[in-house]
């Protein structure tokens, strides 16, 4: 018996608008109906929770209103989007998946997605 496998891309480059999207896919050992997905950021030996959502299989993924994350789910796949990123937010973003119900509980952690964020150059002043 091993930990539940979670797959995510190794590297993602955020858009010039500070938006990064990636897929988190998990190999469910059972028929979970309630799943919790958490995005963690590891950088400079610090770990912070970026966002988290619990969803019922077949329903929409709902984050808190003030969350910087949005997402959709399809089967054992979660499509995550993180917004409002700046260069200082560059780091390893880890997908943590917990199968909450029905028992037994399972935990899986991905190997992390390195998200690179490059702040856009300010537009040069124009006389026009």
């Amino acid at each position: 018996c091993k930990a539940m496998h979670v797959a995510q891309p190794a590297v993602v480059l955020a858009s010039s608008r500070g938006i990064a999207s990636f897929v988190c896919e998990y190999a469910s050992p059972g028929k979970a109906t309630e799943v919790r997905v958490t995005v963690l950021r590891q950088a400079d030996s610090q770990v912070t929770e970026v966002c988290a959502a619990t969803y019922m299989m077949g329903n929409e993924l709902t984050f808190l209103d003030d969350s910087i994350c949005t997402g959709t789910s399809s089967g054992n796949q979660v499509n995550l989007t993180i917004q409002g990123l700046r260069a200082m937010d560059t780091g390893l973003y880890i997908c943590k998946v917990e199968l909450m119900y029905p028992p037994p509980y399972y935990l899986g952690i991905g190997n992390g997605t390195q998200i690179y964020v490059i702040d856009p150059e300010p537009c040069p002043d124009s006389d026009f």
Epitope: M4, Q42, S45, T48, K96, E98, P104, L107
Partner: nanobody
Framework: EVQLVESGGGLVQPGGSLRLSCAAS????????IGWFRQAPGKERETVAC??????SYADSVKGRFTISRDNAKNTVYLQMNSLRAEDTAVYYC??????????????????????WTQGTQVTVSS
């Protein structure tokens, strides 16, 4: 699936010792980091120590006093607590995390990475 059961809590005088055990069933401990955490009344749950196949890591507040070890044959992790102080009084939890290549000595014990939490065992240090 992994199931963890901890034992060994109790009442001890300052300067005394206790040993907590965390026994795993349903899986070998090998692919997991096992951590000990504690929560005192009105405070956040905090890291005490954790161990994987080759490394251990401790909170500064317990270094030199607590020792974490694992017995793979018994599928059990132990927390030997010596020179106990009143401030060590808390509910102690055992939890597991899949061992990952990006874990560092500083992050492998971080509570965000853990699941399979036990119910907790009370440790009270008082005279």
């Amino acid at each position: 699936e992994v199931q963890l059961v901890e034992s060994g809590g109790g009442l001890v005088q300052p300067g005394g010792s206790l040993r907590l055990s965390c026994a795993a069933s349903g899986s070998t401990l090998d692919p997991f980091v096992i951590g000990w955490f504690r929560q005192a009344p009105g405070k956040e749950r905090e890291t005490v120590a954790c161990i994987n196949r080759s490394r251990t890591s401790y909170a500064d507040s317990v270094k030199g006093r607590f020792t974490i070890s694992r017995d793979n044959a018994k599928n059990t992790v132990y927390l030997q607590m010596n020179s106990l102080r009143a401030e060590d009084t808390a509910v102690y939890y055992c939890a597991a995390s899949p061992d990952k290549p990006f874990y560092t000595d500083q992050t492998m014990c971080n509570k965000h990475y853990y699941g399979y939490w036990t119910q907790g065992t009370q440790v009270t240090v008082s005279s």
